[in-house]
Interface confidence: low
Amino acid sequence: GDTRPRFLWQPKRECHFFNGTERVRFLDRYFYNQEESVRFDSDVGEFRAVTELGRPDAEYWNSQKDILEQARAAVDTYCRHNYGVGESFTVQRRVQPKVTVYPSKTQPLQHHNLLVCSVSGFYPGSIEVRWFLNGQEEKAGMVSTGLIQNGDWTFQTLVMLETVPRSGEVYTCQVEHPSVTSPLTVEWRARSESAQSK
Amino acid sequence: IKEEHVIIQAEFYLNPDQSGEFMFDFDGDEIFHVDMAKKETVWRLEEFGRFASFEAQGALANIAVDKANLEIMTKRSNYTPITNVPPEVTVLTNSPVELREPNVLICFIDKFTPPVVNVTWLRNGKPVTTGVSETVFLPREDHLFRKFHYLPFLPSTEDVYDCRVEHWGLDEPLLKHWEFDAPSPLPETTE
């Protein structure tokens, strides 16, 4: 294979937003290979060498009035500006989750099983998934994949409930998400027959 | 206090491959990248282009500066090369799998550097190229990279799939397998 040595330069300009654009932190960061060499932090107000490799750049950029002024103004001219441009399709983006409930394996009643609540295709990632048994919230025996980013501006998550289903029990997966005003709920009823469609 | 949102303008330039990237990231999702060869802005979701514009020429200028800066830093570091970090690979589906219901296989390649990777989808051991798509290299907080590859497919009990990943940090290609699981009862669903 190609075993030549590789050399990587990674600049990153980061805008961190708190409470809308009320508080903004701007970071102008530079990485050689995987190591940060120099950065400007709007909370500091000047360039700082992170490693010795970045010292010449920090000294030079701090000596340049234009560069320093531009970096200090970036919370407004760059961060707040870009937030405003993209707000409607990023910050305000809402996609409702699809919620599906199924047992992980086909088992007769009164056998240990895993009930799966699949929540998929939603945006943003902030979500609350709860399990209820006959109206009472189940807090024990829950296992989750955590939030999975699909890379296409949607998320998914699986929240499993370890249970031994008994006839007549009603299991409910409840999902709260910014795209809906009231929680989404999907019920799964423990029945003796295998098919469980509504 | 944790921030509500983060926007990152992430760039890189890699030698000796002479590959560069310029992209904007919002909370971990790509807003757009600039296609260096075509010199055009590529929106991650087509509708984004209806709300905003980005002048690709500016990114080309940045990449030119990145190239120059990399040369300076390479010299300054006494030609210290990057250490290969191999990827972690996960294959999953976009949504719960139902036989003969269109779905998408996602190959998630994570926590690697440098940003060069060779990814192949295999169906029953043979390469598949129809309908496949991929993201550019996405930044991570630890300054490694992430990447997604997608394969639209029709789930069946006969077909098995692999995502094959090659990276300089791996001794041999890494294959992650996916096949249809034994059927469960029909699911309860809400849209």
Epitope: R55, P56, D57, E59, Y60, S63, Q64, K65, D66 | Q57, G58, A61, A64, V65, K67, A68, E71, I72, K75, R76
Partner: antibody, heavy 120, light 109 residues
């Protein structure tokens, strides 16, 4: 005060190698950010940047001439040397050395220049 | 190789104001500072303006510099006969220093 002075042959033959020395005082080339560059000016023509060496020994060259140029420094002697190979009559020019006080800064002090004629 | 574009010549009468333009691109002027040098006949260039608009000590305030986007300009007010000289702009293109082609300023009269 800062001073720079160029020295080298006034006449070189085509295909020969030109070696110019810039001797400076009033500053140190080991000070972070400082660089010394070479600029030339053919008679009646514009200034053309040739090369620059930084305090940390990074070297930069004009794209069109980089295969012919070599810049080096001797910090203890306060000297910067420029060599230019394969000289041609079109390289006839006044050659200046100048100080850059900061990384990618302006040339704030210049030498008086030395006229180099390339002729057989 | 001349990368920055300047007019070959400008002229003005004593007391007048003249401007000299310097046009570049995003990779040079667009991303970097601009300097201006004055070269009197038979002498070495002298730094006139640095960092777009800063004057070294000893340079009269009749000289001023500005930059907008990928262009820069030098303005001279209250033109005097001793201002007759060649003027050069300079910036950086990636890791290279680049100069303009120079502008000959003639003071009329």
């Amino acid at each position: 005060q800062v001073q720079l002075k160029e020295s080298g042959p006034a006449l070189v033959k085509p295909t020969q190698t030109l070696t110019l020395t810039c001797t400076f005082s009033g500053f140190s080339l080991s000070t972070s950010g400082v660089g010394v560059g070479w600029i030339r000016q053919p008679p009646g023509k514009a200034l053309e940047w040739l090369a620059l060496i930084d305090w940390d020994d990074d070297k930069y060259y004009s794209t069109s001439l980089k295969t012919r140029l070599t810049i080096s420094k001797d910090t203890s002697k306060n000297q910067v040397v420029l060599t230019m190979t394969n000289m041609d009559p079109v390289d006839t020019a006044t050659y200046y050395c100048a100080r850059s006080p900061r990384y990618r800064g302006a040339f704030d002090y210049w030498g008086q220049g030395t006229l180099v004629t390339v002729s057989s | 190789d001349i990368v920055l574009t300047q007019p070959p010549s400008v002229s003005g009468a004593p007391g007048q104001r003249v401007t000299i333009s310097c046009s570049g691109s995003e990779s040079n002027i667009g991303n970097n500072y601009v300097q201006w040098y004055q070269q009197l006949p038979g002498t070495a260039p002298k730094l006139l303006i640095y960092d777009n608009n800063q004057r070294p000590s000893g340079v009269p305030d009749r000289f001023s510099g500005s930059k907008s986007g990928t262009s820069a300009s030098l303005a001279i007010t209250g033109l005097q006969s001793e201002d007759e000289a060649d003027y050069y702009c300079q910036s950086y293109d990636l890791i290279r220093h680049v100069f303009g082609g120079g502008t000959k300023l003639t003071v009329l009269g």
